[in-house]
């Protein structure tokens, strides 16, 4: 009743290992680390066979098959490179996830290296089996913005990609007869969120309470350079419109709002977010220079319908930008207090412009970003949003443009976007 000698499978072993096996002896076949027992096309950890009464084994010896982690999961806004030849996905093979640079960066500077484990899953030393996250890079235009020399640049054409965060917000309120249509600007904060001024997204006619316009009435254009040619731009509808709960219609205090886009927009050379500032109540320092971009649609004779309908020329078809210094708060307050009218420059606002006038945010539509280059992070940061100005013609002497101080609202913005600040801080500060 002796059974034939057993040969262990390649990359495997049999236990107990004996010189001879007799009736009722049992052996357990197992495989080396990184291999699985394969029997009749079924994978298992071990396989048991028995020496039968007639001197035969109850089953043939199975084979040992190398563990296969199979094709790795797709990474949103990322790509995969195989470190092993022939794009192998078997035990100890290595892959590397990377983000679509320069538009996305891996969260926590992860290596992105994953190894196929003995359990058949792709494993990273830090994240385990979880995939890395590709976050949008912010404040780094594909084209370098001009050096900030202290001179006025007004009505200068912006090259495509110079202000990749710039959004044109078009609102058509169909609840009124005839329909109301207006526009504003905004700044892309992530693939799904636009920062703008609250007054842009508030119903324009007689609503005495701060009611946001219906999300169905909002369209956002990104990557737009020339308003006559929207073919290259991304247009998106709104999933949510969020006004700051304390926005005051009388004095424009807390003039800040967010639009969540229906679908995340693909980032590229002409569509990239701007960085949010650090939480700092002081806001930008006096005399710091910032840039504001806009389509300069400040000619009262130009209607929104002309701006939005293709083929119609306006005075500023191409995105314009202006360079302005931050004005000391006390100076701005005094300048407005000396005017007739109830002007209130609060601690949630700052002013920018020149005493002698000449250029102003007539060039930038309401809600547009006032950006300052942050030397520490080497990125452009949105410090202000175009909010309001005096009754005189914009660009008048000693009439400064007033901006929402974004740094006072950083926590509120993160909260609305549903992102913990720790997740996004690395993209603002290095």
């Amino acid at each position: 009743n002796e059974c034939p000698e057993l040969q262990p499978p390649v990359h495997g072993k049999i236990e107990p290992s004996q010189a001879k096996y007799f009736f009722k002896d049992q052996v357990l076949v197992s495989c080396d680390t990184g291999y699985k027992v394969l029997k009749d096309n079924v994978e298992m950890d071990t396989f048991q066979i028995e020496c039968l009464k007639d001197g035969t084994w109850s089953n043939k010896i199975p084979t040992c098959k190398i563990v296969d982690c199979r094709a790795p999961g797709e990474l949103e806004h990322g790509l995969i490179t195989f470190s092993t030849r022939n794009n192998l996905t078997t035990y100890k093979s290595e892959i590397k996830y990377s983000c679509q640079e320069p538009y996305y960066k891996m969260l926590n500077n992860n290596t992105g290296i994953y190894t196929c484990s003995a359990q058949g899953v792709w494993m990273n030393k830090v994240l385990g089996r979880s995939l890395p996250t590709c976050l949008p890079e912010c404040g780094q235009p594909s084209r370098s913005l001009p050096s900030l020399v202290k001179r006025i640049i007004g009505g200068r054409n912006a090259e495509p990609g110079l202000f990749p965060w710039q959004a044109l917000i078009v609102v058509e309120d169909t609840s009124r007869v005839p329909n109301d249509k207006w526009f504003g600007s905004g700044a892309l904060l992530s693939a799904s969120w636009i920062l703008t001024a609250a007054h842009v997204l508030r119903s324009q006619r007689r609503d005495t309470t701060v009611i946001p316009v219906s999300k169905e009435h909002v369209t956002v254009y990104l990557g737009l350079h020339d308003v006559r040619d929207k073919s290259g731009a991304v247009n998106s509808s709104a999933a949510r419109v969020v006004l700051h709960p304390d926005f005051n219609i009388q004095n424009y205090n807390h003039d800040i709002a967010l639009v969540q886009l229906q679908e995340p927009v693909p980032l590229g050379p002409h569509v990239m977010p701007v960085c949010l500032p650090r939480l700092e109540p002081e806001g930008p320092a006096p005399h710091m220079l910032g840039l504001v971009a806009g389509w300069g649609i400040s000619n009262p004779n130009v209607t929104v319908d002309e701006i939005i309908s293709s083929g119609t020329r306006t005075l500023s078809d191409v995105l314009q930008y202006v360079k302005l210094p931050v004005v000391p708060h006390a100076e701005c307050k005094t300048s407005y207090e000396s005017r007739s009218g109830n002007y209130s420059v609060t601690e949630n606002m700052f002013c920018a412009g020149y005493y002698e006038g000449g250029k102003d945010t007539c060039l930038g539509d309401s809600g547009g970003a006032f950006v300052i280059f942050d030397d520490l992070s080497q990125r452009w940061v949105v410090q202000g949003l175009v909010s309001w100005g005096g009754p005189e013609e914009c660009g008048s002497k000693q009439v400064y443009g007033v901006y929402t101080k974004v740094s006072n609202y950083v926590d509120w913005v993160w909260e609305q976007m549903g992102l913990p600040q720790s997740v996004v801080e690395p993209q603002v500060e290095r």
Epitope: S175, R176, V177, P178, D180, K181, G184, P300, V304, S366
Partner: antibody
């Protein structure tokens, strides 16, 4: 075509309330503001307020705040205006209109003891 | 509230002649966002509801004869009937909807 049809004339005693209806047809009722305007005999037009049926948002002229109430029933495309604590000077023709353009035929409300 | 003042209170014009009605608001009706003046003109004939003639100060409602035109911006507005017809005898009202709406007191147009 867009039409607004109002309920019939009412005679009320001072201190009572009146509820005027305005049935809309020919457009999406929930998406447009309905305004209410009144006109006293031989007088000019006076704006009372408005309602957006889809959301229930309302705006009232200061004079009618707390005394006028607007409601809307989307299932029947009907807007309602209720005016309480009636006095003789509330005697007027009450009109509903779709935002700016189309007017109802008017409802005469007479307040008399 | 914005106060709307119409002038004159009444107007007698010969058939085929021009009729001009003015409307002045106590504050500007020009919305800087939409670049529209929120002023409308209505015509009301006896026993009828008002009828919209002009909106946004100068845009003629469809179906309104082109002898009716609106002009003005900010605080001063005008309704012009270029050649008065018998059927134009009515009371004309201006209405602002820049804020909580208010009407002018009305101008009665008659045939001389």
């Amino acid at each position: 075509q867009v039409q607004l049809v109002q309920s019939g004339a009412e005679v009320k005693k001072p201190g009572a309330s009146v509820k005027v209806s305005c049935k809309a047809s020919g457009y999406t009722f929930t998406g447009k503001w309905i305004e209410w305007v009144r006109q006293a005999p031989g007088q000019g037009l006076e704006w009372i307020g408005e309602i957006l049926p889809g959301t229930g948002s309302t705006n009232y002229a200061q004079k009618f705040q707390g005394r006028a109430t607007f409601t809307a029933d989307s299932s029947t495309s009907t807007a309602y205006m209720e005016l309480s604590s009636l006095r003789s000077e509330d005697t007027a023709v009450y009109y509903c209109l779709r935002s700016e353009d189309v007017w109802g035929q008017g409802t005469l409300v007479t307040v008399s003891s | 509230d914005i106060v709307m003042t119409q002038s004159p209170d009444s107007l007698a014009v010969s058939l085929g002649e021009r009729a001009t009605i003015n409307c002045k608001s106590s504050q500007s009706l020009l919305n800087s966002r939409t670049r529209k003046n929120y002023l409308a003109w209505y015509q009301q004939k006896p026993g009828q509801p008002p009828k919209l003639l002009i909106y946004w100060a100068s845009t003629r409602e469809s179906g309104v004869p082109d002898r009716f035109s609106g002009s003005g911006s900010g605080t001063d507005f005008t309704l012009t009937i270029s050649s008065l017809q018998a059927e134009d005898v009515a009371v004309y009202y201006c209405k602002q909807s820049y804020n909580i709406p208010t009407f002018g007191q009305g101008t009665k147009v008659e045939i001389k």
